[in-house]
């Protein structure tokens, strides 16, 4: 069920217990570029938002360009994904406890709006990678992720033949692709215009209520 392994009682307006997150969400006027939609209420700091826009940022030493230069149209989705991960205070219903050296909690099965996943896949399927799960299996001996020996660089489409394969497989099911569309109030938007407020607040409220009913 949705609430299996759910230890938290506070599901709304919360920050995850992870590497760079604030312990409490709040305004951050100077959030950088693609993270700016969260400036009214964020779990990330301005410096985190700045750092995550860099190639091989110090946050995780993760190199998007592990198979040659990632297309800018593709990279922007990974930056947005990282903004959502670091900054969103509206993912409480999907927080799970984990036993990892670098974080105590993670997101699991966040219902990502189907168009956000589709567009991510469309913009990335001709960029190159060497792995279908980016959480594990890298060669970290240099301090930066490199393709493990024998893992061939191929198009994203080779490793992620469908949008769901990308969005769900990439980060070990942090996301699941929702059947709902953007603006429905039933799925999390990676992209939104903050002038209209943060649509993910309503989504979190809906799923938090559903969890309390179960």
């Amino acid at each position: 069920t949705m609430c299996s392994a759910q230890d938290r009682t506070d599901l709304l307006n919360v920050c995850m217990d992870a590497k760079h997150h604030k312990t409490k969400p709040g305004p951050e006027d100077k959030l950088h570029d693609q993270c700016s939609p969260w400036k009214k209420n964020a779990c990330c700091t301005a410096s985190t938002s700045q750092e995550l826009h860099k190639d091989t940022s110090r946050l995780y030493n993760f190199n998007w360009d592990h198979c040659g230069k990632m297309e800018p149209a593709c990279k922007r989705h990974f930056i947005q994904d990282t903004c959502l991960y670091e900054c969103s205070p509206n993912l409480g219903p999907w927080i799970q406890q984990v036993n990892q050296s670098w974080r105590k909690e993670r997101f699991l099965d966040v219902p990502l709006c189907k168009e956000d996943c589709q567009r991510w896949w469309e913009d990335c399927h001709t960029s190159h990678t060497c792995k279908s799960n980016w959480h594990r299996g890298w060669d970290w001996t240099s301090g930066v992720n490199k393709c493990p020996a024998g893992a061939l660089c191929r198009t994203f489409e080779s490793y992620f033949p469908t949008p769901a394969a990308l969005c769900e497989g990439l980060w070990s099911h942090s996301y699941k692709v929702s059947n709902y569309s953007r603006g429905s109030g039933r799925c999390i938007q990676m992209w939104f215009d903050s002038a209209q407020g943060n649509p993910n607040e309503e989504v979190a409220r809906f799923y938090a209520a559903a969890m309390h009913v179960n």
Partner: antibody, heavy 118, light 106 residues
Framework: EVQLVQSGAEVKKPGASVKVSCKAS????????MHWVRQAPGQRLEWMGW????????KYSQKFQGRVTITRDTSASTAYMELSSLRSEDTAVYYC???????????WGQGTLVTVSS | ELTQDPAVSVALGQTVRITCQGD??????ANWYQQKPGQAPVLVIY???NRPSGIPDRFSGSSSGNTASLTITGAQAADEADYYC???????????FGGGTKLTVL
């Protein structure tokens, strides 16, 4: 800029062997598979086999199994294709090609003409 | 084995479709190459209708069942060439090429 530069033309006698080289530059050599494809005069392209440049694993076409050997030297970013027991019908242009998606070859060498004649 | 029509012609500016048939295409995408005399092949379409950079958008690919198609919309004189399809053969990760189609632009 990705480039694949092949060795020069060869003339061989029937029964001999030939070894064609393909030097890669402009990308991480060990991250991609390299395939070999040949084309006899006026004929179709014919796939011969491939090598995983990272770990050296190879796959060969049934037609060439036992006669072809594909190797690589990672320090020189170079792939090699050796064909033995040559016969006149092996006269062809031999190409190396980088694989980006199970048979999608985005960069090709300029080709090496191998002529087998007594 | 992949089967192609040996020759196809098209009037300048018109649309032409080149087909490729074979069992491997039921479970694998076709890739398409353009080859001009004395030159190495050039990848024009791969995977699910992807064009490498530098390939004009008049080239497109599609597939249905065991048949893949390359469509050139508004053929130009520069498109006159041989066109080859290829496909992965899932068993053994082998690759097979079609026999090629000679395109003439009239």
């Amino acid at each position: 800029e990705v480039q694949l530069v092949q060795s020069g033309a060869e003339v061989k006698k029937p029964g001999a062997s030939v070894k064609v080289s393909c030097k890669a530059s402009g990308y991480t050599f060990t991250s991609y598979a390299m395939h070999w494809v040949r084309q006899a005069p006026g004929q179709r392209l014919e796939w011969m086999g491939w090598i995983n440049a990272g770990n050296g694993n190879t796959k060969y076409s049934q037609k060439f199994q036992g006669r072809v050997t594909i190797t690589r030297d990672t320090s020189a970013s170079t792939a090699y294709m050796e064909l033995s027991s040559l016969r006149s019908e092996d006269t062809a242009v031999y190409y190396c090609a980088r694989d980006i998606s199970y048979g999608s070859f985005d960069y090709w060498g300029q080709g090496t003409l191998v002529t087998v004649s007594s | 084995e992949l089967t192609q029509d040996p020759a196809v012609s098209v009037a300048l500016g018109q649309t032409v479709r080149i087909t490729c048939q074979g069992d491997s295409l039921r479970s694998n995408y076709a890739n398409w190459y353009q080859q001009k005399p004395g030159q190495a092949p050039v990848l024009v379409i791969y995977g699910q209708n992807n064009r490498p950079s530098g390939i004009p958008d008049r080239f497109s690919g599609s597939s249905s069942g065991n048949t893949a198609s390359l469509t050139i919309t508004g053929a130009q004189a520069a498109d006159e060439a041989d066109y080859y399809c290829d496909s992965r053969v899932s068993t053994g990760n082998h690759v097979v090429f079609g026999g090629g189609t000679k395109l003439t632009v009239l």
